[in-house]
Each structure stands twice: as structure tokens, then as C-alpha cells.
Amino acid sequence: RLSWYDPDFQARLTRSNSKCQGQLEVYLKDGWHMVCSQSWGRSSKQWEDPSQASKVCQRLNCGVPLSLGPFLVTYTPQSSIICYGQLGSFSNCSHSRNDMCHSLGLTCLEPQKTTPPTTRPPPTTTPEPTAPPRLQLVAQSGGQHCAGVVEFYSGSLGGTISYEAQDKTQDLENFLCNNLQCGSFLKHLPETEAGRAQDPGEPREHQPLPIQWKIQNSSCTSLEHCFRKIKPQKSGRVLALLCSGFQPKVQSRLVGGSSICEGTVEVRQGAQWAALCDSSSARSSLRWEEVCREQQCGSVNSYRVLDAGDPTSRGLFCPHQKLSQCHELWERNSYCKKVFVTCQDPNP
């Protein structure tokens, strides 16, 4: 009975730049298969303690498991499987329809290194010329995951991507966010000057990269065909993206109700909690479903906008339909209409 506890079990983690994290694929008698996160009776949304995958991490010569669950972006190769029975058992698996399969992601602790892994790539002289082309998102101010300036590396060459506002590149941006395991494209980040002055005190690894790229094919389906090398521009805009997988997300809570599953919606910006103001772009229940889910309550029972007769009522405003799409909250200093939400209480 094959399981991930067996000594001859073979696994690999794909779709990432590290052998210690990625989409879980296993080798069964007829080749490599992607494992669906709906396996072993789990839902594609909810997974439990990742320590049950310790043996997989060990086999890959990585450290302990950090997280196990649905991979943010599902890439479906020829063969994906759903397995049944005990967690980690591969004796009873069936081929899954690709459109039904959400792949299973696993992150293990990187093996011990002298210095911590950085969130920037190594200097451009390091990669071997044979290294596959890869992308990196460099956070602009203090570090936001899945948001920042796009850098493209091909062999030993790396640099930013020159971008003109009139470029029609929606397909490309979705492809890039997807490739970075960051979900789908949300928006361009505010204009960033490629030729900004270098702070002499800035550490060496944060200095501008020696080359620049231009978009060559905005409908490309593999990285090597997307960009061409150009002379670095002294000024101009570089491609900076916000993808749907960005972190940290806006946190919400419900206050003033009779349980944690009802109340006026508040959101947190930094250390401050403030009322979330009603937004005409979020009149459907989608926003409130998400808020209820974050409180670990059931689905939305009702929501109502409270009258904002008070011109001094203040709060925070999210221009998107869902809070999870909100990269930044805007302050509203008057006529903030609060929203009272009632979610189903799982423990009435």
C-alpha cells in the first residue's frame, strides 16, 4: 500500500524556484501526477496541520513543513489525481478532470544556510547561463508579498521591464502574476521611475540592475518569448504589478453585535481599527461573505447600511468589490455610512 511514509515513495515540488516548495507531484507506476487538494476527503479550501507531510519534506532533504493546502494558482499538466483513504495514501487514486482539480501546494523549511534567504534574487553574476528564465517581484516600500517592480532574469542577465502606459498588456500581466504564483493581475502600481537616483548608503544588492527589457510579445505563453533586451533608459516607467495573492491583506472584524458573527464592520490599517464605509462598488453580498468567512462564521444572513446623517462620521473606504482586493484603504472624513452585517453563527 503506497503512501508518502514508504521509503521508496517519490515526490517533487514544481512550479517554484525552490525544491522545498511548490505544487506536489508524485511518481506512481505510470509516471508523474499532480495531486489534487481535494484528495483524502479534504475540501479544496480547507487544510489542517501541515506536519503530516513531514516525511515528504524529509525525502526532499528540506526542513519541517510550513504549510500544506490548495496552491494559489493551479497549473494542470496532463495528469492530475484525486486520492482516497488515509491522508498520504496513494493506493487508491483516480484520474481527475483537470478543470475539477485544485493542485496541492506544500512549503517546507529551506535547509540550513549561512544567511537567511532574501526576498531579492542573488546578484546578476550568480545564475548559470543555463538557468531557466525567471521573474522576481521586488517590493517597493518595506515589502509586500506579490506586489512590486517586476524583474526578469534570463541566464546571467537581469533587469526591470520598461513599460508604456499605452501598452495593451492585460494578458501579459495575468501571465506574469500567474507565473509568480501570485494569482491574477489586479492593477499597475503607481509610476516608478527607472532612473531614480541611487542612495549612496543603499546596500549593494538594492542598486539598479545593469540591463533593461522591453515587452516583445504581450500574448506570450512562455517567459523566454515575452521580453527583449534594450539599452537601459535614464528615465521612464518600469513595470510594477499588484497581483491578487498580495499580503498583508486587510483584516476585518464585527463590533457591537450580540456575538462575534454580527456587528458593524471595522477594518484595520496598521495598528488602527476604523469603521468600513459603504461603497457603491460593493453592493453585492460578495464582500460580506468574505468578512463572515474571516470571522470563521457561516455565510451572510443579512447586511444593512446604517444612515450617515452625521457629517463628521469617519472611516475607511475600499474601492474594490472584495476587501481581499484592497491594496490600500482610503480615509473618508465625512458622511461615512457604516454597514451592519449578520453572519450565520456556527455555534449559536
Partner: nanobody, 119 residues
């Protein structure tokens, strides 16, 4: 923005205790993992402990039974309670957070806080 600020280090006697804190700026979903590493002078940085979003923990063998990692309910602050300290625990202690979804996480590090165990 993801910024980590450690505090609570200092000079402590052998056998003594100290509690390190690490606060993250911004609000972060609870699916993250937080942990501590340390680096003693002239040595490699080594893993100390981690705590996952669901609350499960893992420790390096050298600190098991002496150190306790915990996090507050809001999931944005992690603590390392260090008891029964030994001179070999002297090091700079670094806080780390892993953000993202399973299989696609990025790590972010604090600046470090010095702990010196000496009589």
C-alpha cells in the same frame, strides 16, 4: 508593507529567563507561519522554533523543553519565552515570517535582537 521589529533581548545570567517579542506592521492573514532563528558569533544562522497559522509548533533539538514559542490571537505578534538559558544560547535572535499560500511562500526577516548569557 511587511516589517518585523524584535524586542526583549539583553544580558541575562545562566539559568535565567528572557522573553523576546516580534511585532509585524500591517495586518496579516492567519495563514502565515512565524518563527525564530539565531546566529552566534562566527557560527552559521540556525533554526530555533516556528509556529504555524493553526498553532502547531516545532523546535530545534537544542532548545526543546526550554524555549516556548507562542503568538497572540491577532496573529501578528510572536513571542519566544527562553528559560534555563545557557552561555551557548548567546546569539543575535532573528524573527521571520513566511507569507503566501502553500507552495508559494516568501520569507521576511527582522533586524535581530542580541541575547547575551553570561555571569
Amino acid at each position: 508593507q511587511v516589517q518585523l521589529v524584535e524586542s526583549g533581548g539583553g544580558l541575562v545570567q545562566p539559568g535565567g529567563s528572557v522573553r523576546l517579542s516580534c511585532a509585524t506592521s500591517g495586518s496579516i492573514f492567519s495563514t502565515n507561519v512565524m518563527g525564530w532563528y539565531r546566529q552566534a558569533p562566527g557560527k552559521e544562522r540556525e533554526f530555533v522554533a516556528l509556529i504555524r497559522g493553526g498553532g502547531s509548533t516545532h523546535y530545534a533539538d537544542s532548545v526543546k523543553g526550554r524555549f516556548i514559542i507562542s503568538r497572540e490571537n491577532a496573529k501578528t505578534t510572536v513571542y519566544l519565552q527562553m528559560n534555563g538559558l545557557k552561555p551557548e544560547d548567546t546569539a543575535v535572535y532573528y524573527c521571520v515570517i513566511w507569507l503566501g499560500s502553500p507552495g508559494a511562500m516568501s520569507d521576511y526577516w527582522g533586524q535581530g535582537t542580541q541575547v547575551t548569557v553570561s555571569s
